[in-house]
Amino acid sequence: LIIGFGISGKHFITVTTFTSAGNIGEDGTLSCTFEPDIKLNGIVIQWLKEGIKGLVHEFKEGKDDLSQQHEMFRGRTAVFADQVVVGNASLRLKNVQLTDAGTYTCYIRTSKGKGNANLEYKTGAFSMPEINVDYNASSESLRCEAPRWFPQPTVAWASQVDQGANFSEVSNTSFELNSENVTMKVVSVLYNVTINNTYSCMIENDIAKATGDIKVTDSEVKRRSQLQLLNSG
């Protein structure tokens, strides 16, 4: 969370950004909010990126002005125009690329004053894991798969019954490069599992952490998975 203040004569406004993460090959959002101003025509939003000449995006007088936009962002950016009056200056970025990572500045000017705040935008790949029982194995085992991760994550197993146990000796993890030669498929197999226990497969890199849980009983298999972005305010 970064809060910036701006001073314009006696006036300053608070601009707030959150460290954001973009999943490459998807649309992303760079979050920025400011003190609302009901006079839409008096609001100017400028997004800049460190090391890039020209603007990432500009919105003023109630509409986009792309006249000074850098070619790298042409056709890819948008603000949420209907939410600007309530103080939302967040930027939508189409088809996030690894090269979009960096430090961005959200600069705001309204009739109340001006202000800006920086934002660290991280890019990578992260996806939900899916755990299945591997009945083909010689002993009962679990297979945890997640289709897209970058940078290479760590994988760890845990169980509800054997809390604190180290499963590295009874698991095998592999990383298979996907066809675009950047992201990787994560596959981890846990051997010698017992029924009536809940196992968790945790995949984590510096951008995201994902957990898949599976509970195997005599009568059913229950699954749950969740994903959280790290350092996002």
Epitope: E26, D27, K63, R74, G75, K94, N95, A125, T183
Partner: antibody, heavy 116, light 109 residues
Framework: QVQLVESGGVLVKPGGSLRLSCAAS????????MSWIRQAPGMGLEWVSY????????YYTDSVKGRFTISRDSAKNSLYLQMNSLRAEDTAVYYC?????????WGQGTLVTVSS | EIVLTQSPGTLSLFPGERATLSCRAS???????LAWYQQKPGQSPRLLIY???SRATGIPDRFSGSGSGTDFTLTISRLEPEDFAVYYC??????????FGQGTKLEIK
């Protein structure tokens, strides 16, 4: 050079199924958002379905939800549209298109006719 | 749901004249996500303009795009015989994800 070639369009009876293919060359399919767009005879363009570069996000227009499935095979650099429970109103030329900045490349289209 | 309305439905002009085609959105569209296409009979559509005002590769400079918010315009400064076709505007990012206008037919007078 960039090329998209659709195939699979035929005459099919209402309620039938069909799988359209789109073979891409000159670029890597998984670097771009890809869509299927259709055009009924004498009518305008209608977006049908989309798959993100990552392959993780998929959308459909309301009229085909639950009936059509978009997919891709990165190894074959191909895009597919599985069409089930076909209706007369699905009759159209189906195009696959690459979304670079706008739909910058289109296939030649394949005609799907749904009629008894 | 966002609706793009193109006008006029049909535009009849002489070669050499200036053509102005309009695309109006039912709600605000990001300029970045607004494109124009040309389609000739029996052919696939061709991207003319992206990001509201940027010409696509190989498009002659007689084609220009402008506008923002809800009102966008495609202008052909001096019509050539090959310009007579159907023109579509298209947006990305709202619901539905992609939307096309119904088209404007540009015909020879």
């Amino acid at each position: 050079q960039v090329q998209l070639v659709e195939s699979g369009g035929v005459l099919v009876k209402p309620g039938g199924s069909l799988r359209l293919s789109c073979a891409a060359s000159g670029f890597t399919l998984s670097d771009y958002y890809m869509s299927w767009i259709r055009q009924a005879p004498g009518m305008g363009l209608e977006w049908v379905s989309y798959i993100s570069s990552s392959g993780s996000t998929i959308y459909y227009t309301d009229s085909v939800k639950g009936r059509f499935t978009i997919s891709r095979d990165s190894a074959k650099n191909s895009l597919y549209l599985q069409m089930n429970s076909l209706r007369a109103e699905d009759t159209a030329v189906y195009y696959c298109a690459r979304d670079g900045v706008g739909f910058d490349y289109w296939g030649q289209g394949t005609l799907v006719t749904v009629s008894s | 749901e966002i609706v793009l309305t193109q006008s006029p439905g049909t535009l009849s002009l002489f070669p050499g004249e200036r053509a102005t085609l309009s695309c109006r959105a039912s709600q605000s569209v990001s300029s970045s996500y607004l494109a124009w296409y040309q389609q000739k009979p029996g052919q696939s559509p061709r991207l003319l303009i992206y990001a509201a005002s940027s010409r696509a590769t190989g498009i002659p400079d007689r084609f220009s795009g402008s506008g923002s918010g809800t009102d966008f315009t495609l202008t052909i400064s001096r019509l050539e015989p090959e310009d007579f076709a159907v023109y579509y505007c298209q947006q990305y990012g709202s619901s539905p994800l992609y939307t096309f206008g119904q088209g404007t037919k540009l015909e020879i007078k």
